[in-house]
Interface confidence: low
């Protein structure tokens, strides 16, 4: 609440509830394929009403409570810790009939030296300590168990892993006399997976490692390691996949260069370069081999690490990501945007689009925003007429019985969805924009004019008159 500059920030609780061990997954019913919505897209509301009605009528047959809450489990191995030495943990909501497991990595920037970690501990302790996490957490967006909110994977086993290591999920160093803080992000993921095997994950068919923001980057850094871990532990049949939301950053030139003073103003390459040493950070082995010693920071950038990954990964990224703009020293205040800044922002979108060119499974709307998959309204945004849950469903189909993305896209079921229009919020399904200065909602026309876009220039590539474009934008069509 107070003066936060976070990507995402959550959580607190007293002692954990008594543990209840899950029954082993042996003998679970074989799960059907994902629903194919192709035939019902024209009448989704009616279809969802039927699904809900069916779910409610089947409720008496189910031992599960229709309860949205994920319950906290602190790790049994208390040597795997948050920054301050308190045990790391995870929130779990089991779905006994399902062989799909969704593990979500929370985001929330990072800190990379004693000074900014101390400051983070003072102002955002939930991102460095489990001492006060709540016992329960509500599943929202892709973590929701409601088919209306999560048409993609509502019936999956849901796991939320709070971010308390401040290391972009890469660290492997414990607290000691020498180290004031532990940075164990990579080890926390490994330990959570190990514990979940005893809670039913052993019977999984698909494990989807998802994350937003720093958690999205964490997915890119850890997905292959999780697959390797499961193979080594004797579970090679579990298909491991990644879903990286808002964690695909560019190591581009800042709009205005500033010295590396704090987390926000430090150029991303420099912050990660310093962080990796401070955290004893680990990166995917195949990526590490591509760079010289001391250059491992390169592997934190999606477009560099992605080609080295073995597991299929779906990339979700706003073309005009607010966290990217923040580290690039772009701050959209109440003042109209200057020409140079407008061109910088447009160029950022172009560069990002270019890096996604060879990413077969991607969803990149031309919006100014940050994070999407655990927002309740994550279903609202569309690219070329396809929503994100629909694109993920198509991705599942394309991967069915195969670890590699099929080369030929399924007809009418696209997975590569990158907006091609060139300015922020040219996609009418973008989330509402707020003036960062006043907090007021702005309509798209207002926003574009505030951004310094001349309506004539914006209208011409669309073959429209400026008045037609304004009317179209105002109607949100």
């Amino acid at each position: 609440s107070e003066g936060r500059k976070t990507w995402r920030r959550r959580g607190q609780q007293p002692p954990p509830p008594p543990r209840t061990e899950a029954a082993p997954a042996a003998g679970q019913p074989v799960e059907s394929f994902p629903l194919d919505f192709t035939a019902v897209e024209g009448n989704m509301d009616s279809f969802m009403a039927q699904v809900k009605s069916l779910a409610q009528s089947l409720y008496p047959c189910s031992a599960q409570q229709l309860n949205e809450d994920l319950r906290l489990h602190l790790l049994l191995d208390t040597s795997v810790t948050c920054n301050d030495g308190s045990p790391a943990g995870y929130y779990l909501k089991e779905s006994r009939g399902s062989r799909r497991w969704l593990l979500f990595l929370e985001g929330g920037w990072y800190c990379f030296n004693r000074e900014n970690c101390d400051s983070r501990y003072d102002t955002m302790r939930r991102l460095m300590s489990s001492r006060d996490w709540p016992r329960t957490r509500t599943g929202t967006g892709i973590l929701s168990s409601q088919p209306e909110e999560n048409p993609y994977w509502w019936n999956a086993n849901m796991v939320f892993i709070p971010y308390c290591s401040s290391d972009v999920w890469s660290g492997a160093s414990s607290k000691s006399e020498k180290n004031e803080y532990a940075f164990m992000g990579a080890l926390i993921i490994q330990e959570v997976v190990r514990e979940l095997l005893g809670r039913g994950l052993s019977g999984a068919k698909v494990l989807l490692l998802a994350g937003s923001s720093a958690g999205g980057t964490g997915v890119l850094l850890n997905v292959d390691r999780v697959a390797e871990q499961l193979e080594k532990l004797g579970y090679p049949a579990i298909q491991v996949r990644g879903l990286a939301d808002s964690g695909w950053f560019l190591d581009n030139k800042q709009y205005r260069h500033t010295d590396c003073v704090d987390t926000i103003t430090c150029a991303p390459t420099e912050a990660i370069r310093r962080g990796i040493r401070y955290w004893n950070g680990v990166v995917p082995e195949r990526c590490r081999r591509q760079f010289q010693e001391g250059e491992e920071w390169n592997c934190f950038f999606g477009y560099k690490v992605y080609p080295t990954l073995r597991c299929p990964v779906f990339v979700v990224q706003w073309l005009f990501d607010e966290a990217q703009l923040t580290v690039d020293n772009v701050h959209l205040t109440g003042q109209p945007v200057q020409e140079g800044l407008r061109l910088y922002i447009q160029n950022l979108g172009r560069e990002l689009r270019h890096t996604l060119k060879d990413v077969p499974a991607s969803f990149a709307p031309a919006c100014l925003s940050h994070e999407i998959i655990i927002r309740s309204h994550w279903t609202d945004v569309q690219v070329k007429g396809t929503s994100l849950p629909r694109a993920l469903h198509c991705w599942d189909r394309s991967l069915h019985d195969s670890h590699k993305a099929s080369k030929t896209p399924l007809k009418g079921c696209p997975v590569h969805l990158v907006d091609s229009c060139p300015w922020p919020h040219c996609n009418p399904s973008c989330p509402t924009v707020r003036d960062q200065f006043t907090g007021q909602e702005m309509n798209v026309a207002q926003f574009l004019m505030h951004m310094g876009f001349d309506m004539q220039t914006v209208a011409q590539p669309q073959g429209l008159e400026p008045s037609e474009l304004l009317g179209m934008l105002s109607n949100g069509s």
Partner: antibody, heavy 119, light 111 residues
Framework: EVQLVESGGDLVKPGGSLKLSCAAS????????MHWLRQAPEKGLEWVAY????????SYANTMKGRFTISRDNAKKTLSLQMTSLRSEDTAIYYC????????????WGTGTTVTVSS | DIVLTQSPASLVVSLGQRATISCRAS??????????MHWYQQKPGQPPKLLIY???NLESGVPARFSGSGSGTDFTLNIHPVEEGDATTYYC?????????FGSGTKLEIK
């Protein structure tokens, strides 16, 4: 035992000043953000001011901005509220409360000290 | 500021029955899976006591007769079964942003 004890409440004339103190014990005071809240006679609860654990963030209710100053001394485990230009509507029981790390709720309250502003 | 409207202002419930108190926020107090709404009990001459935090989490030492639910703008405190000692005033409070605000209180009477 975790405890907060307020002191300094008194009868004061309108326009006068008063300094309230809150002594903490039984927990690591420097780890917690602290708040002052108040409750006028037969009325509900009202938030007054907040100070973060390291004093880096200070915040005040609009009606008290410029008149009240919150401060803390982590070495002495004390929280203070300096009140100036007091008005009759400042008459209330003043409570100090501990902010639970980041949930923003008040998990430990003091017993309160009474401030009466009257001519 | 976010305004919290608590209802009813007073409530009479028979011993052993359920008491339900509502709190409505003027805008959502939920964010990314957490609902920043809390409930307190205040007995005459005493400071408030935390019962429920983050909408549904029971503070340690509080009897399981107390429960909280809700998200977004609508929240509920339930007490079941009601006991004699529960006859007092209850407040909701949000901490979604500064300033935190309180509801105007609900006075519970037991008959």
């Amino acid at each position: 035992e975790v405890q907060l004890v307020e002191s300094g409440g008194d009868l004061v004339k309108p326009g006068g000043s008063l300094k309230l103190s809150c002594a903490a014990s039984g927990f690591t005071f420097s780890d917690y953000g602290m708040h002052w809240l108040r409750q006028a006679p037969e009325k509900g609860l009202e938030w007054v001011a907040y100070i973060s654990s390291g004093s880096t963030t200070l915040s005040y209710a609009n009606t008290m901005k410029g008149r009240f100053t919150i401060s803390r001394d982590n070495a002495k485990k004390t929280l203070s509220l300096q009140m100036t230009s007091l008005r009759s509507e400042d008459t209330a029981i003043y409570y100090c409360a501990r902010k639970n790390y980041n949930g923003g709720y008040f998990d430990v309250w003091g017993t309160g000290t009474t401030v009466t502003v009257s001519s | 500021d976010i305004v919290l409207t608590q209802s009813p202002a007073s409530l009479v419930v028979s011993l052993g029955q359920r008491a339900t108190i509502s709190c409505r926020a003027s805008k959502s107090v939920s964010e990314s899976g957490y609902s920043y709404m809390h409930w307190y009990q205040q007995k005459p001459g005493q400071p408030p006591k935390l019962l429920i935090y983050l909408a549904s989490n029971l503070e340690s030492g509080v009897p399981a007769r107390f429960s909280g639910s809700g998200s977004g703008t609508d929240f509920t405190l339930n007490i079941h079964p009601v006991e004699e000692g529960d006859a007092t005033t209850y407040y909701c409070q949000h901490s979604r942003v500064l300033p935190p605000t309180f509801g105007s209180g609900t006075k519970l009477e037991i008959k």
